[in-house]
Interface confidence: medium
């Protein structure tokens, strides 16, 4: 189970902001409706990803791909699927 | 729908202190570049976000959570 | 290929300050963390301290006191300063490159070292 | 700081043996581990990360295991270029700590 098929725009709007990438974080954030209050502050943390450096973005990106793929994550995952494939079966 | 623990984290990271959120990132990847990264980015966006901020940022991820895209 | 070249005086006076140079060529200095490293003739290596190009550092604590690392991302060098150095400081300097990765923090480059003498 | 003991110290071994060189953390490191070698004269040479993943280009003859505080370098056949020291170096925690080495030679 990969960590974006669990909320695939979290992730488009994370990695946007960690890349310091604002067209990016412009048309992901455009898919949510946000408003340009939500906009300003979104791009509060992408300067501090940029500020920081490369490095900086390859360092947070490791901490959520840690997490999303911890027991955490893919425990609750599998556990989703497990319900899902459930209700499939139940559905036919 | 997105992993409790992620959420955590990303909530955490607005709303917490530098030592709550440093002490979460701690419980899934300790290397010590990366814990001080983690406070690094942690203390710029408290100086760079009003609670204003924080609010707006947090509706937003309301947003995301609850979007048919996630 | 990146390659690191340590420069600096071979001799130092004791209670004067160390000073020496790494060289960084074949890439960025901006992508990466850089230490400095040194082992005494015949024993092991110790760790004295990192900087990321945009001026943070961590010291060892052992040394902490006397060191200064600093970073010149224009000339794509960083530099160590070890004050009140004694006959002890005498050793091979290193410097080397961090590769951070999902689960590691290695020393993946090297300089070829360069030998620092204390004595009067 | 996380003292790391290396053992043994010093070691003679013939070409095609097997060879085994322990290092031991103060505390737990998780698998934050490093290998590194270091031939005369020499910088040392970076061989395995996270105590069992073999650097790019390295040798397989060169492995590594182990976990939380004790860890094994092995040579699973040892050949004359081998000859040096090789270090344990951890990262796991701040400062970063090596080994005190185990010198290699070849009888």
């Known amino acids: 189970v990969k960590m974006a098929e669990t909320c695939p725009i979290f992730y488009d709007v994370f990695f946007a902001v960690a890349n310091g990438n604002e067209l990016l974080l412009d048309l992901s954030l455009t898919k949510v409706n946000a408003t340009e209050p939500e906009r300003t502050a979104m791009k509060k943390i992408q300067d501090c990803y940029v500020e920081n450096g490369l490095i900086s973005r390859v360092l947070d990106g490791l901490v959520m791909t840690t997490i999303s793929s911890s027991k955490d994550c893919m425990g609750e995952a599998v556990q989703n699927t497990v319900e899902d494939l459930k209700l499939n079966t139940l559905g036919r | 729908e997105i992993c409790p623990a992620v959420k955590r984290d990303v909530d955490l990271f607005l709303t917490g202190t530098p030592d709550e959120y440093v002490e979460q990132v701690a419980q899934y990847k300790a290397l010590p570049v990366v814990l001080e990264n983690a406070r690094i980015l942690k203390n710029c966006v408290d100086a760079k976000m009003t609670e204003e901020d924080k609010e707006n940022a947090l509706s937003l991820l309301d947003k995301i959570y609850t979007s048919p895209l996630c | 290929q990146v390659q690191l070249q340590e420069s600096g005086p071979g001799l130092v006076k004791p209670s004067e300050t160390l000073s020496l140079t790494c060289t960084v060529s074949?890439?960025?200095?901006?992508?990466?963390?850089w230490s400095w490293i040194r082992q005494p003739p015949g024993k092991g290596l110790e760790w004295i301290g990192y900087?990321?190009?945009?001026?943070?550092?961590n010291y060892n604590p052992s040394l902490k006191s006397r060191v200064t690392i600093s970073v010149d991302t224009s000339k794509n060098q960083f530099s160590l300063k070890l004050s009140s150095v004694t006959a002890a400081d005498t050793a091979i300097y290193y410097c080397?490159?961090?590769?951070?990765?999902?689960?590691?923090?290695?020393?993946?480059?090297w300089g070829q070292g360069t030998l620092v003498t204390v004595s009067s | 700081d996380i003292q790391m003991t290396q053992s043994p110290s010093s070691l003679s071994a013939s070409v095609g043996d097997r060879v085994t060189i322990t290092c031991q953390a103060s505390?737990?490191?998780?698998?934050?581990l490093n290998w590194y070698q270091q031939k005369t004269g020499k910088a040392p040479k970076f061989l395995i990360y996270?105590?069992?993943n073999l650097e790019t280009g390295v040798s397989s003859r060169f492995s590594g295991s182990g976990s939380g505080t004790d860890f094994t370098f092995t040579i699973s056949s040892l050949q004359p270029e081998d000859v040096g020291t090789y270090y344990c170096?951890?990262?796991?925690?701040?400062?970063?700590?090596f080994g005190q080495g185990t010198k290699l030679e070849i009888k």
């Open positions: 505390q737990d490191i998780n698998n934050y």
């Open positions: 170096h951890q990262y796991g925690d701040l400062p970063y700590t």
């Open positions: 996270d105590a069992s």
């Open positions: 080397a490159r961090h590769r951070v990765t999902r689960t590691a923090d290695s020393f993946d480059y």
């Open positions: 900087i990321y190009y945009s001026g943070r550092t």
């Open positions: 074949g890439g960025s200095i901006s992508s990466y963390y």
